[in-house]
């Protein structure tokens, strides 16, 4: 699986998973979040060859295609597959609040 | 130039609902949560709740009971305020407002022109 | 919920003198070191605007001839050398609790 304990350990060029830390006050300016300070929200790049975790059998004849067609332009995106969600703690003026975001966090990519 | 542009008056019956809008531009409309606040003919002001555009997480204020629902279209950056129920006692003018971005409520930095609405059989 | 009561309802004063309004919170409003209390002009027929952030921050592009100070529940907007644009009504407001609450307002007017 194109999952973060594959990808963080693997030096891999193809469609995985990525590290990104976002900082919430300083990359999103959003100051009233108190916990937590950010997150790895990660993200999904690299190329999608045949048969690389293809997600749908239109991806794997669009990989195929591509792949005996080097010069089309059309070929399978690697996008996020599993996502997990953040908790948040934040203040309504002295009242504390927790929410669960959904989505938040890519756990594992697969090209579609 | 940070502007909220909201929508026309509205005249509406007793029971029925309203939907104001809030069209922002200037500031990036998922970091900042945006305020409703409401001011009756010759009163001061009340504080509705608040939405946070970028999840849509809200905080009402009690007094409304329930009658007021906040919404946003990250995709045209425009806030909603919906008031259902409608009796007299909310004829007034309503005011979009940005808050000031420290804190979740906070003080309220740029604010629509307002939208009068008026209830009448 | 917090009550903030302002005083004067109303007051005139003459050009280039000084006006003072006060405002009480039912319960202190400090919190981290900081006082939830800021204070708007709302002009005859516009939009409340910001002047006072934290009690005591000017906003960006207010006159320097108003002022904030206080802390805990009592609180005070001084305007200096008042001029004919100041009229209006003035509003203080907390968030240090929820729900937000505003005081009931000065109306300042000209003599």
């Known amino acids: 699986a194109l999952d973060t304990n594959y990808c963080f350990r693997n030096l891999e060029e193809n469609c995985c998973v990525r590290p990104l830390y976002i900082d919430f006050r300083q990359d999103l300016g959003w100051k009233w979040v108190h916990e937590p300070k950010g997150y790895y929200a990660n993200f999904c790049s690299g190329p999608c060859p045949y048969l690389r975790s293809a997600d749908t059998t239109h991806s794997t004849v669009l990989g195929l295609y591509n792949t005996l067609n080097p010069e089309a332009s059309a070929s399978p995106c690697c996008v996020p597959q599993d996502l997990e969600p953040l908790t948040i703690l934040y203040y309504v003026g002295r009242t504390p609040k927790v929410e669960q975001l959904s989505n938040m966090v890519v756990k594992s990519c697969k090209c579609s | 130039e940070v502007q909220l542009v909201q929508s026309g008056a509205e005249v509406k019956k007793p029971g029925a609902s309203v939907k104001v809008s809030c069209k922002t531009s200037?500031?990036?409309?998922?970091?900042?949560?945006m305020n409703w606040v409401r001011q009756a003919p010759g009163a001061g002001l009340d504080w509705m709740g608040q939405?946070?555009?970028?999840?849509?997480?809200?905080n009402y204020n009690e007094m409304f009971e329930g009658r007021v629902t906040l919404t946003a279209d990250t995709s045209t950056s425009t806030a909603y305020m919906e008031l259902s129920s409608l009796r007299a006692g909310d004829i007034a003018v309503y005011y979009c407002?940005?808050?000031?971005?420290?804190?979740?409520?906070?003080?309220?930095?740029?604010w629509g022109q307002g939208t009068l609405v008026t209830v009448s059989s | 919920d917090i009550v903030m009561t302002q005083t004067p309802p109303s007051l005139s004063v003459s050009p280039r003198e000084t006006a003072s309004i006060s405002c009480r919170a039912s319960?202190?409003?400090?919190?981290?070191?900081?006082?939830?209390m800021h204070w708007y002009l709302q002009k005859p027929g516009q939009s409340p605007q910001l002047l006072i952030y934290?009690?005591?921050n000017l906003e960006s592009g207010v006159s320097d001839r108003f002022s904030g100070s206080g802390s805990g529940t009592d609180f005070t907007l001084r305007i200096s050398r008042v001029e004919a644009n100041d009229t209006g009504v003035y509003y203080c407001?907390?968030?240090?609790?929820?729900?937000?609450?505003f005081g009931q307002g000065t109306k300042l007017e000209l003599k």
């Open positions: 407002a940005r808050g000031y971005g420290n804190y979740a409520l906070d003080a309220m930095d740029y």
């Open positions: 200037g500031y990036t409309f998922m970091t900042y949560w």
């Open positions: 939405i946070f555009p970028a999840w849509g997480s809200t």
């Open positions: 319960e202190s409003v400090d919190s981290y070191g900081n006082s939830f």
């Open positions: 934290l009690a005591s």
């Open positions: 407001q907390q968030n240090n609790e929820d729900p937000l609450t």
